[in-house]
């Protein structure tokens, strides 16, 4: 039911694991701790998920309700242009950047911001719910 691509939509699936928030057809995990961008990505991958890839403005607006001024890592990187971890370009929102060394993307309640990938920030994972209730 929910297997397949990490990035596929996931219709009519069971509920999310403990500590993950269900919205629409996906589960979201908002971290308590902080990690650098690569370690945040690793954290998500180990739990059958990926760093948040936002599909449209509607999803972005909803998620921002749960965010504060503090920035969270998402699956967005500047690799010859801003791209999501699923390979798609960032085309529905602007990202503010102060420096060319800020090549990883973060989000807070006000929008998207480029940041140096080594900075420890909170992060957001996203995944499809699974039929069996694993902790992760």
């Amino acid at each position: 039911l929910c297997q397949g691509s990490n990035y596929s939509t996931c219709a009519s699936c069971p509920s999310c694991p403990d500590r993950w928030m269900k919205y629409g057809n996906h589960c979201y995990y908002f971290s308590v701790e902080e990690k650098d961008w690569n370690s945040s990505l690793e954290f998500c991958l180990a739990r059958d998920s990926h760093l948040l890839v936002i599909t449209d403005n509607q999803e972005m607006s909803l998620l921002q309700v749960f965010l504060s001024e503090a920035f969270c890592w998402i699956g967005l990187r500047n690799n010859s242009g801003w791209r999501w971890e699923d390979g798609s370009p960032l085309n529905f929102s602007r990202i503010s950047s102060n420096s060319f060394v800020q090549t990883c993307g973060a989000i807070n309640k006000n929008g998207l911001q480029a940041s140096s990938c080594e900075v420890p920030l909170h992060w957001v994972c996203k995944k499809c719910p699974f039929a069996d209730q694993a902790l992760f």
Epitope: Y29, K35, D36, N38, R47, V119, P120, A134, F136
Partner: antibody, heavy 120, light 107 residues
Framework: QVQLQQSGAELVRPGASVKISCKAF????????INWVKQRPGQGLDWIGY????????NYNQKFKGKATLTVDKSSSTACMELSSLTSEDSAVYYC?????????????WGQGTLVTVSA | DIVMTQSQKFMSTSVGDRVSITCKAS??????VVWYQQKPGQSPKLLIY???NRYTGVPDRFTGNGSGTDFTLTISNMQSEDLADYFC?????????FGAGTKLELK
């Protein structure tokens, strides 16, 4: 209560391999990552990596890639670590550890340690 | 890799002393530092997590503080059972890394 029971001490020849185990009791095995940590006599701690028993996902410290291989056997709630091409540098106590809270990497529970001695 | 430096390998103390053990990260690790105590022949025991939170059952004479790159574990009223090695660990970046340890000894 939560317990991690490790296999006994090993004396092995240089160049050989060794497989040490960590059996989990008192919790749902697939709910908590198993981490492995190395401690050389009188020295600090070195994180080797972890395995997620739920899906087999591993994350290795680059320093131990090719040296350590982490596996799990869900049916017996046991995690194993195989160390290959052993040298005197691999002589150490090896611990398995879990955080018990799967969203943090603070190790609240540790095995008793397995001493591996590499000697001709 | 992030290097965690515990500059004092040994510290001499007396019962009743206030002891501060320091740990310095080679880059910003936020508040993701953990402290462990290890006695000879035993496995490490978790004392402090997230830089300043005492783990369940840890006596309140143990306190942790710091953020960014500088961290301290303080024992406010040193007891003989506190003679041990103390290690810091960062959780901000893989690989997870530990300090080399600080051994508390009696004067």
């Amino acid at each position: 209560q939560v317990q991690l029971q490790q296999s006994g001490a090993e004396l092995v020849r240089p160049g050989a391999s060794v497989k040490i185990s960590c059996k989990a009791f008192g919790y749902t095995f697939t709910n908590h990552f198993i981490n492995w940590v190395k401690q050389r006599p009188g020295q600090g701690l070195d994180w080797i990596g972890y395995i997620n028993p739920y899906n087999g996902y591993t994350n290795y410290n680059q320093k131990f890639k090719g040296k350590a291989t982490l596996t799990v056997d869900k049916s017996s709630s046991t995690a194993c670590m195989e160390l290959s091409s052993l040298t005197s540098e691999d002589s150490a106590v090896y611990y398995c550890a879990i955080s018990y809270d799967g969203y943090y990497e603070r190790f609240a529970y540790w095995g008793q340690g397995t001493l591996v001695t590499v000697s001709a | 890799d992030i290097v965690m430096t515990q500059s004092q390998k040994f510290m001499s103390t007396s019962v009743g002393d206030r002891v501060s053990i320091t740990c310095k990260a080679s880059q910003n690790v936020g508040s993701t530092v953990v402290w462990y105590q290890q006695k000879p022949g035993q496995s490490p025991k978790l004392l402090i997590y997230s830089a300043s939170n005492r783990y369940t059952g840890v006596p309140d004479r143990f306190t942790g503080n710091g953020s960014g790159t500088d961290f301290t574990l303080t024992i406010s009223n040193m007891q003989s059972e506190d003679l041990a090695d103390y290690f810091c660990q960062q959780c901000s970046s893989y690989p997870l890394t530990f300090g080399a340890g600080t051994k508390l000894e009696l004067k």
